[in-house]
């Protein structure tokens, strides 16, 4: 007997799907060719079958739903919308499925999604609207509570004209939809800053993850609006110092643990109000492992053994004085 | 030499059905979604079906929805229209197309076509 | 639906002369990643066969004379010189979403 589907149409909101039903009657629970179910575990596993699209006959029960290891390219609007909707659909991991397109309104019509992964895609396109599903300036609020972004910087070559940070900013912040968000990962995306409004704008983030991309400074992101902020990934950027300003954000924070490891910390004076906070601070996590990477003459050194006549900065002379 | 040879068309009355079948050969057939397409006596093209490689995505123009249903057997390399309840405006030239995917495809091997009428 | 529209819906070329096609569509139809617009070619008698894919793509096996361009929402076909085997039927498609859709033909005839 041929396949079925449970797919059909959402007009307006989602073109896409509006021709996904089948000409018998649906079959809601029958498992997708490719795919393995459980529906006791309400699993569905599609994974590394390279799927060039996301499958249209998904059981109604489905609660995780994993879509690794394919080849999708492209999730338009309304992907994963279906009638019945896909109603109790809590995780959805789309990662490594060599997405490079993200459209708006993707993820309508899942009503109880709480957990995106969209890592290890390399994502040239993600809409401004791919979260929130509209252009409204206010859109109904997303169920989102975790989202994960890890690696879904493209190539070089693939980027286009425009700062990819602005890019992700753009969907993070749309319509103000993520304001439920607890969980943010956007680890390993060579993201060289944090615009300033990002996180003012996320204040339920618990958990935000910028380890392994390049931030060189934190100077203009302010931590004040997030209370509930309980760890902060900074491993494995570019830092160079923190300032007055972040450290007595940070240490305002009342839950917070704040991990540092690998960072090219240059010990020279700026550092003194950093190196005084540290040896005070509990916030940081392992912080007895940061060690200078500048100048030359305190590498390796470790921050906390520093006393502020380590500390010195080379004086600028005046350019008559300067020899080239 | 990619091949699709269409067949299973012919007259059939209003309200009666036919199973139209494509045999492809000359590629590796499990790896390719595919459609059907159609032409309407000295009209133009009209997309009509589409299933993916894997047998797991199904899509089907609004004028097709509920009567006509796509199928494949990828161990004979074949690719089936079963088309119920018929209608005057379902008379056409029926084409099989290979693609790659379905967004980011086209139709990139076409069969010679094979002709339904439907007609009291 | 996404409608395209073809223009002109019929030309009559002296060989070696060029030749254009229109084909606009309702919507955009390219994102920054990939423009979903293809060309086909139905000569007399025959199944379509394509020509160009993702608006500028020349199918293998197709003459270097046939060019495609455009984005968004307007798209051109070119011939440079046309050559008696290329008269027939021109057709556009989009496939940016379900249904995709084709341009009504463009007929193209030897004068």
């Known amino acids: 007997s041929s396949p079925t589907s449970s797919a059909s149409s959402f007009s307006s909101s989602a073109p896409f799907l509006a021709s996904a039903v089948s000409a018998q009657p649906p079959l809601p629970d029958q498992c997708p060719a490719l795919c393995e179910c459980s529906e006791a575990a309400r699993t569905v596993k599609c994974v590394n079958r390279n799927l060039t699209e996301v499958p249209t006959d998904l059981p109604a029960y489905v609660r995780n739903l994993f879509l690794t290891g394919n080849q999708l390219a492209v999730l338009p609007a309304g992907a994963f919308a279906r009638r019945p909707p896909l109603a109790e659909l809590a995780a959805l991991n789309l990662s490594g499925s060599r997405l490079d397109e993200v459209r708006a309104g993707a993820f309508e019509h899942l009503p109880s999604l709480r957990q995106l992964d969209l890592s290890h895609n390399p994502l040239a396109d993600l809409s401004p609207f791919a979260f929130s599903g509209s252009n409204a300036s206010v859109s109904a609020p997303s169920p989102l509570v975790e989202l994960i972004l890890n690696h879904i910087v493209p190539p070089e070559d693939e980027r286009q004209n425009r700062s990819f940070e602005g890019m992700v900013v753009a969907a993070l912040l749309a319509g103000r939809a993520l304001q439920g968000l607890r969980r943010l990962e956007l680890a390993s995306n060579h993201f060289l800053y944090l615009p300033r409004d990002v996180l003012a704008q996320l204040p339920s983030l618990r958990h935000l993850d910028l380890s392994n991309n390049s931030l060189v400074s934190l100077t203009y992101v302010s931590f004040r609006n997030l209370t509930h902020l309980e760890s902060l990934h900074l491993e494995d950027n570019a830092l160079k110092v923190l300032h007055n300003g972040t450290l007595a954000e940070l240490q305002g924070l009342p839950h917070i643990r704040v991990f540092l490891d690998n960072n090219p910390w240059v010990c020279d004076c700026h550092m003194a109000d950093m190196v005084t906070w540290l040896k005070e601070t509990e916030v940081v996590q392992g912080k007895d492992r940061l060690t200078c990477a500048y100048p030359e003459k305190m590498r390796n050194r470790v921050l906390l053994e520093l006393n502020s006549a380590d500390l010195d900065c080379d004086p600028i002379l005046p350019p008559s004085l300067q020899t080239s | 030499e990619v091949q699709l040879v269409e067949s299973g068309g012919g007259l059939v009355q209003p309200g009666g059905s036919l199973r139209l079948s494509c045999a492809a050969s000359?590629?590796?057939?499990?790896?390719?979604?595919m459609h059907w397409v159609r032409q309407a006596p000295g009209k133009g093209l009209e997309w009509v079906a589409y299933i993916s490689s894997g047998s797991t995505s199904f899509y089907y123009a609004d004028t097709v929805k509920g009567r006509f249903t796509i199928s494949r057997d990828n161990a004979k390399n074949s690719l089936y229209l079963q088309m119920n309840s018929l209608r005057d405006e379902d008379t056409a030239v029926y084409y099989c197309s290979r693609t790659n995917s379905l967004l980011r495809g086209f139709f990139d091997a076409w069969g010679q076509g094979t002709t339904v009428t439907v007609s009291s | 639906d996404i409608v395209m529209t073809q223009t002109p819906l019929s030309l009559s070329v002296t060989p070696g002369q060029p030749a254009s096609i229109s084909c606009r569509a309702s919507?955009?139809?390219?994102?920054?990643?990939?423009?979903?617009l293809h060309w086909y070619l139905q000569k007399p008698g025959q199944p379509p066969q394509l020509l160009i894919y993702s608006a500028s793509n020349l199918e293998s096996g197709v003459p270097d004379r046939f060019s495609g361009s455009g984005s968004g929402t307007d798209f051109t076909l070119k011939i440079s010189r046309v050559e008696a085997e290329d008269v027939g039927v021109y057709y556009c498609q989009h496939s940016w979403e379900i249904p995709l859709t084709f341009g009504q033909g463009t007929k193209l005839e030897i004068k």
């Open positions: 919507q955009s139809v390219s994102s920054s990643s990939y423009t979903y």
């Open positions: 000359g590629f590796t057939f499990s790896n390719f979604g």
